[in-house]
């Protein structure tokens, strides 16, 4: 009689993570008597995947009634496949004895596992940066297989070209990770901008995964200051305004100085938002010029988002204004941005 052959018809099988893998195996004879076992890998370190008669293999079921005496189909199904299951599986016939001895092995079936990449996570710099500066964004995605993957960067829909990407590990692995770093030059208009990392993989069926970062969390647009003297509101009173324009984020503190002395400090609250996402704010002082003999140097000093203060000054000429007699008390309009100085 012809010697028993162990036939594994599939050289390779590819399965999506979470699905079941069917590994086919048939033998051509019932002789010699002895069990079939399935192993992953070859040699002394091979891993037992299924033993017909004993052991605990909760994920493995036989495709046919392999326990029937005349059965020659020893195909198995492995449930809930993960990337860790990848490898070459061998169907091995044993000859019964003391102990059982390996009689013949199939040629092996290579199981590859298609695993989706995790949602890309995009992270930006730890500290805010100002326009014209170049900042780095990183994108990471893990757990995918096979290794081939495509990663693209976009800023507001425009593809970026200045980036570096690594897929790890370099050699064979059950699953892989991708890490990419993109360089982005900030502009004053970037408060509403988004940086997008897009990952395409065979498991995603043409529907790439995206991770985003809002540049509003990265950018700092410093304010421009303008101090102007408004027309006289009443006799001997001058309205001086400080226009704080185009700043982001909103965190801002303004201090008025008169001849170098602190007059008032306030925090930006009721700001107006520009179309580009930056903010404007205005503060003003009412100055009673009759209280001053000499010219007054008014300074608007702004500390924005914890940065060193910037300031703009305005020289208020008082020589042209006749002094009002007997006015030497100070009054403050609380709850507004006004300050009367006598």
């Amino acid at each position: 009689e012809e010697e028993l052959q162990v036939i594994q018809p599939d050289k390779s099988v590819s399965v999506a993570a979470g699905e079941s893998a069917i590994l086919h195996c048939t033998v051509t004879s019932l002789i010699p008597v002895g069990p079939i076992q399935w192993f992953r890998g070859a040699g002394p370190a091979r891993e037992l995947i299924y033993n017909q008669k004993e052991g605990h293999f909760p994920r493995v079921t036989t495709v046919s009634e392999s326990t029937k005496r005349e059965n020659m189909d020893f195909s198995i199904s492995i449930s809930n496949i993960t990337p860790a299951d990848a490898g070459t599986y061998y169907c091995v016939k044993f000859r019964k004895g003391s102990p059982d001895t390996e009689f013949k092995s199939g040629a092996g079936t290579e199981l590859s596992v298609r695993a989706k990449p995790s949602a890309p996570v995009v992270s930006g710099p730890a500290a805010r940066a100002t326009p014209q500066h170049t900042v780095s964004f990183t994108c990471e995605s893990h757990g995918f297989s096979p290794r081939d993957i495509t990663l693209k960067w976009f800023k507001n829909g425009n593809e970026l070209s200045d980036f570096q990407t690594n897929v790890d590990p370099v050699g064979e692995s059950v699953s892989y990770s991708i890490h990419s770093t993109a360089k982005v030059v900030l502009t004053r208009e970037d408060v509403h901008s988004q940086v997008i990392c897009e990952v395409a993989h065979v498991t995603l069926q043409g529907d790439p995964l995206r991770g985003t970062a809002n540049l509003s969390e990265t950018i700092r647009v410093p304010p421009t200051l303008e101090v102007t003297q408004q027309p006289v509101r009443a006799e001997n009173q001058v309205n001086v305004t400080c226009q704080v324009r185009k700043f982001y984020p909103q965190r801002l503190q303004l201090t008025w100085l008169e001849n170098g002395n602190v007059s008032r400090t306030e925090t930006a609250s009721t700001v107006t938002e520009n179309k580009d996402g930056t903010y404007n704010w205005m503060s003003w002082l009412l100055v009673n010029v009759s209280a001053h003999r000499d010219d007054v140097k008014l300074t608007c000093q702004v500390e924005h988002d914890g940065q060193p203060a910037v300031s703009k000054s305005h020289d208020l000429k008082v020589s042209a204004h006749p002094k009002e007699q007997g006015s030497n008390t100070a009054a403050e309009n609380t709850g507004s941005n006004e300050r009367n100085i006598y």
């Epitope: 008597v33 002394p44 370190a45 091979r46 891993e47 008669k53 004993e54 052991g55 605990h56």
Partner: antibody, heavy 113, light 108 residues
Framework: EVQLVQSGAEVKKPGATVKISCKAS????????MHWVQQAPGKGLEWIGR????????KYAPKFQGRVTITADTSTNTAYMELSSLRSEDTAVYYC??????WGQGTLVTVSS | EIVLTQSPATLSLSPGERATLSCSAS???????LYWYQQKPGQAPKLWIY???NLASGIPARFSGSGSGTDYTLTISSLEPEDFAVYYC?????????FGQGTKLEIK
């Protein structure tokens, strides 16, 4: 549901023979090796042997070889373990198990004169 | 015959502590054939960990198994009151199959 129900406790005299049964349900014993394990009072587990009910092939631990006989009746889906020439040190709980994963509740055998 | 030696014989710990149980084989055992069982007084052993590191159905994730060759370990990351029992390692790599003598995990 896999279940292994063993026969009740036995009291035997030294030199006698005891035969314990293990009735299986929820599976066909022909499909699995059936093992027997001994546990003396306050002691650990000791593997006695196993049977392949499909062809009645057996394997025994050297310690029990010659005194133990494991059999199976596939028509009643039952495995048996017979231990002869009993001595006091054979006083123990005896467990059957299916393929190392599912265990019977145990049978206490007391050997006493 | 492969002799399995478990250490320590008794381990006294408090709930919340980490437990490490060792099983040393007199000759190499393939990791596929190394199992752990838990046994409580008056009960049959229960399969706890199979193929060195796989938890049997319903076993909490605080349990883990590791090892290869001749040295194997069962670890409980944070002991719960129900974990106090006797644990046996078992090899079925070659006949005769053997068990370790057991480690009794008791409440301190």
């Amino acid at each position: 549901e896999v279940q292994l129900v063993q026969s009740g406790a036995e009291v035997k005299k030294p030199g006698a023979t005891v035969k314990i049964s293990c009735k299986a349900s929820g599976f066909n014993i022909k499909d699995y090796y059936m093992h027997w394990v001994q546990q003396a009072p306050g002691k650990g587990l000791e593997w006695i042997g196993r049977i392949d009910p499909e062809d009645a092939e057996t394997k025994y631990a050297p310690k029990f070889q010659g005194r133990v006989t494991i059999t199976a009746d596939t028509s009643t889906n039952t495995a048996y373990m017979e231990l002869s020439s009993l001595r006091s040190e054979d006083t123990a709980v005896y467990y059957c198990d299916r393929g190392l994963a599912y265990w019977g509740q145990g049978t206490l055998v007391t050997v006493s004169s | 015959e492969i002799v399995l030696t478990q250490s320590p014989a008794t381990l006294s710990l408090s709930p919340g502590e980490r437990a490490t149980l060792s099983c040393s084989a007199s000759s190499s055992v393939s990791s596929s054939y190394l199992y752990w069982y838990q046994q409580k007084p008056g009960q049959a052993p229960k399969l706890w960990i199979y193929s060195t590191s796989n938890l049997a159905s319903g076993i909490p994730a605080r349990f883990s198994g590791s090892g290869s060759g001749t040295d194997y370990t069962l670890t409980i990351s944070s002991l719960e009151p129900e974990d106090f029992a006797v644990y046996y390692c078992h090899q079925w790599s070659s006949y005769p199959y053997t068990f370790g003598q057991g480690t009794k995990l008791e409440i301190k």
